[in-house]
């Protein structure tokens, strides 16, 4: 807390300018009017204030706006944003995407800080849902943003926003996040034709159930091995050799290189060896001919 001292004669600030960098902390406190600071916040960024001086300026704004800063001030905070605590930010009501962009720009190139996380949370909650423009903005600054959301937050993403998602935005997603996103993607892309649909849905297939993979296998999609390797093991295991062959098309030859890795390894162990042999790839480890296979899906259909 800076002590209240009178402003020396002739030092009262008429505007926010470069001369203020020569002011001591107590002089800034005494000679800069908080209301003036609030109206000229856009100038602060252009002036090389020290961290200590920025602390004083923040203190002045805090006194002027104890219930939280108005958006007109927030939009021009610039580097002063880095001085804010999550508790400060929780008092704000940020509604403009331009304000959000301006503050994210300050933190650009750095990991998402608790301050930024709180800001985004406040912004999204204020909007009620994660719309396409917001998602576009957030993933541009933080490609892993989508994968940092809770199941509840993801479930509030409208299918229309899925169009903004790029494959790299899903790189760090947990299978449980893909579970939530996949049905939304399916809905978002449902009116596209077969090949276009597959291009769009590909990144989300880590959340696809077996039935959908079976359906895709009937559509000549030619899934590449990289995508196949990202599929859920539990979704791949019930697929027949014929279904996997149709799903991969010409890429089926890639199974040989991946036969020791999941989900290919586990899938091989579930197939009859003579079915695997029909692929002509030399895949080994299937169920020997003559052994009884307990087909759970068949049993399900019979009961």
């Amino acid at each position: 807390e800076v002590e209240k001292t009178a402003c020396p004669s002739g030092k009262k600030a008429r505007e926010i300018d470069e001369s203020l960098i020569f002011y001591k902390k107590w002089e800034l406190e005494a000679c800069v009017d908080a209301a003036l600071l609030a109206t000229q916040m856009d100038r602060v960024n252009a002036i090389p204030f020290t961290y200590e001086q920025l602390d004083v300026l923040k203190h002045k704004l805090d006194e002027l706006y104890p219930q939280g800063y108005p958006e007109s001030v927030i939009q021009h905070l610039g580097y002063l944003f880095l001085k804010m605590s999550p508790e400060d930010i929780r008092k704000w009501n940020v509604t403009s995407l331009e304000t959000l962009k301006a503050l994210l720009e300050v933190n650009k190139g750095h990991e998402m800080s608790p301050q930024v996380a709180t800001l985004i949370d406040r912004f999204v909650k204020g909007r009620g849902q994660l719309d396409k423009d917001t998602l576009d903005t957030l993933t541009a600054f933080y490609p892993g943003y989508l994968c940092s959301l809770s199941p509840e937050e993801l479930s509030s993403v409208p299918p229309s926003s899925i169009w903004a998602v790029r494959p790299q935005d899903l790189d760090t997603c947990d299978p449980r996040q893909l579970d939530v996103l996949y049905p939304k993607a399916r809905l978002a892309f449902q009116n596209m034709n077969g090949s276009e649909y597959f291009v769009k849905i590909q990144s989300f297939l880590g959340g696809a159930p077996t039935e959908d993979l079976k359906a895709l296998s009937q559509q000549n999609v030619s899934m590449d091995l990289a995508t196949f390797m990202k599929l859920r093991t539990d979704a791949v295991l019930p697929l027949t050799v014929a279904e996997v062959q149709k799903l991969l098309g010409p890429h089926v030859e890639g199974l040989k290189a991946e036969e020791r890795h999941r989900p290919v390894r586990d899938w091989i162990l579930r197939q009859r060896q003579d079915d695997l042999d029909t692929l002509g790839l030399g895949l080994q480890g299937g169920i020997p001919n003559g052994y009884l296979v307990l087909d759970l899906s068949m049993q399900e259909a019979l009961s």
Epitope: G144, C147, S148, S150, P151, E152, E153, L154, S155, S156, T172, D174, P175, R176, L178, D179, V180, Y182, P183, R186, G207, A208, P209, T210, E211, D212, R232, D234, A235
Partner: antibody, heavy 121, light 112 residues
Framework: QVQLQESGPGLVKPSQTLSLTCTVS??????????WNWIRQHPGKGLEWIGY???????YYNPSLRGRLIISVDTSKNQFSLRLSSVTAADTAVYYC?????????????WGQGTTVTVSS | DIVMTQTPLSSPVTLGQPASISCRSS???????????LSWLQQRPGQPPRLLIY???NRFSGVPDRFSGSGAGTDFTLKISRVEAEDVGVYYC?????????FGGGTKVEIK
């Protein structure tokens, strides 16, 4: 307020298939962001996670049970089910269904009362 | 699989006194999203488990504030500030960071 209730036979013969259903009331199984789990507890022992299903039909199974296990969902009936084949005495346990998700993983906030399944001839 | 080890196996406590249960995981529970999905559940005799704490220290709604969770990485603690008669039961830690989800072996809290 969401409630879960397990149902199914209390006695299953060895080598047969154990079938249980969990009925969800007070909320929709299709409301996004929740994962519908099966967990079991062997007599006098700790808890073992079996697997979960999302309303879309996507599943994740415990690898120790993979191959014998099918979890399915029927959104029209607001139910999800467990089928465990080739059972042995080691599958004797109290089987619970539970809801996970919401604002975190591991937030298993709603549990069924549990149903005791004995595997015996 | 991540192995969850709880100590002690049993904890006899005097009513009104504090109790502490430790849980250690075989590897870090920090998820790629930087959260740590460690929960604590209580199971009273003859009842299903009940959620107490999730994400290390978040108390679930309706859970008395005498229950608190702490820890990081691989070491976690559940504390009961003043044990009441209704707290008798088995307490489990659970990790939901990595599949398969796994539970600790349980700690039995009983009154001396």
């Amino acid at each position: 307020q969401v409630q879960l209730q397990e149902s199914g036979p209390g006695l299953v013969k060895p080598s047969q298939t154990l079938s249980l259903t969990c009925t969800v009331s007070g909320g929709s199984i299709s409301s996004g962001g929740y994962y519908w789990n099966w967990i079991r507890q062997h007599p006098g022992k700790g808890l073992e996670w079996i697997g979960y299903i999302y309303y879309s039909g996507s599943t994740y199974y415990n690898p120790s049970l993979r191959g014998r296990l099918i979890i399915s969902v029927d959104t029209s009936k607001n139910q999800f089910s467990l089928r465990l084949s080739s059972v042995t005495a080691a599958d004797t346990a109290v089987y619970y269904c539970a809801r996970d998700g919401g604002d975190s993983y591991g937030r298993m906030d709603v549990w069924g009362q549990g149903t005791t399944v004995t595997v015996s001839s | 699989d991540i192995v969850m080890t709880q100590t002690p196996l049993s904890s006899p406590v005097t009513l009104g006194q504090p109790a502490s249960i430790s849980c250690r995981s075989s590897q870090s529970l920090v998820h790629s999203d930087r959260n740590t999905y460690l929960s604590w559940l209580q199971q009273r005799p003859g009842q299903p488990p009940r959620l107490l704490i999730y994400k290390i220290s978040n108390r679930f709604s309706g859970v008395p504030d005498r229950f608190s969770g702490s820890g990081a990485g691989t070491d976690f603690t559940l504390k009961i500030s003043r044990v009441e008669a209704e707290d008798v039961g088995v307490y489990y830690c659970m990790q939901a960071t990595q599949f398969p989800l796994t539970f600790g072996g349980g700690t039995k809290v009983e009154i001396k």
